[in-house]
């Protein structure tokens, strides 16, 4: 199993631009999680899906952030417009 696959591995953008992060969960997993990690704020859960349905998006109250899971094998996290403070490592995770 290839595990969870994210793209891109690295992203550099200008402030104000749209950024889209993509995730392919492990096949058969029905829960998907997006996290953000920074030195200042640590690891934050942004949103999680169960059976493609968003369950809790309270980690991303700014409407610059939006996440979709159109099917069981794909999810996106979009930031529009992006800000310098969005610089972070974004993790996607999946579970049974």
């Amino acid at each position: 199993d290839a595990g969870v696959i994210q793209s891109p591995r690295h992203e550099v953008t200008e402030m104000g631009q749209e950024v889209t992060l993509r995730c392919k969960p492990i096949s058969g997993h029905n829960s998907l999680f997006w996290y953000r990690q920074t030195m200042m704020r640590g690891l934050e859960l942004l949103i999680y899906f169960n059976n493609n349905v968003p369950i809790d998006d309270s980690g991303m109250p700014e409407d610059r952030f939006s996440a979709k899971m159109p099917n069981a094998s794909f999810s996106t996290l979009k930031i529009q417009p992006s800000e310098p403070r969005d610089s972070a490592v974004y993790f996607c995770a999946s579970s049974l």
């Epitope: 934050e44 942004l46 309270s58 980690g59």
Partner: antibody
């Protein structure tokens, strides 16, 4: 029926502290982000702070950072706002509100904080 | 911080009138949210994501706009609509409010 009930307001001297509480019922509290908003007498609404469902994501109004601390206890269905080094300009009605529809979909009735010597 | 400016700040109108309140943002926002507040009461969510009516809100209320300029329209004022209206943005923290528009009976 969603209900939010604030408490803990009162009269406090400048430099003093208060802890506000917001008791939630009628919904699964642990699934929702929560806000504090305040309104000074005769003035408009001012956003104070936000906390996510699991307390991992917290935001404050820039002017209040360092003096106010938001927290929650999901086992007690309660939201808190610890307010330290209070000033006269902190006098206001403080509301808690649930995050819903991307906004604040339910509000409490408010609790009044008066900072005066 | 993104400053929201509502106009007008005060508005006198009559029952049956069509009323429009504008909310301008100092920086572009994705959506605007509108609240109604009556004296001594907590605010009530009217419109979310710019144009969606909150549950129980009458269809005479509508919202529109994009970028830096948004509007709240009441198509035919009813006696219970006289109140103060606030816009708010959630595009970027801090989640600022407009200064409010007080709608009074003419």
């Amino acid at each position: 029926e969603v209900q939010l009930v604030e408490s803990g307001g009162g009269l406090v001297q400048p430099g003093g502290s208060l802890r506000l509480s917001c008791a939630a019922s009628g919904f699964t509290f642990s699934n929702f982000g929560m806000h504090w908003v305040r309104q000074a007498p005769g003035k408009g609404l001012e956003w104070v702070s936000y906390i996510s469902s699991g307390s991992r994501t917290i935001y404050y109004a820039d002017t209040l950072k360092g003096r106010f601390t938001i927290s929650r206890d999901n086992s007690k269905n309660t939201l808190y706002l610890q307010m330290n080094s209070l000033r006269a300009e902190d006098t206001a009605v403080y509301y808690c509100a649930r995050r819903g529809e991307g906004a604040m979909d339910y509000w409490g009735q408010g609790t009044t904080v008066t900072v005066s010597s | 911080d993104n400053q929201l400016t509502q106009s007008p700040s005060f508005l006198s109108a009559s029952v049956g009138d069509r009323v429009t309140i504008t909310c301008r943002a100092s920086s572009s926002v994705n959506y605007i949210y509108w609240y109604q507040q009556k004296p001594g009461k907590a605010p009530k969510l009217l419109i979310y994501y710019t144009s969606n009516l909150a549950p129980g809100v009458p269809s005479r209320f509508s919202g529109s706009g994009s970028g830096n300029e948004y509007t709240l329209t009441i198509s035919s004022l009813q006696p219970e609509d006289f109140a103060t209206y606030y816009c708010q943005q959630f595009t970027s923290s801090p989640f600022t409010f407009g200064q409010g528009t007080k709608l009074e009976i003419k």
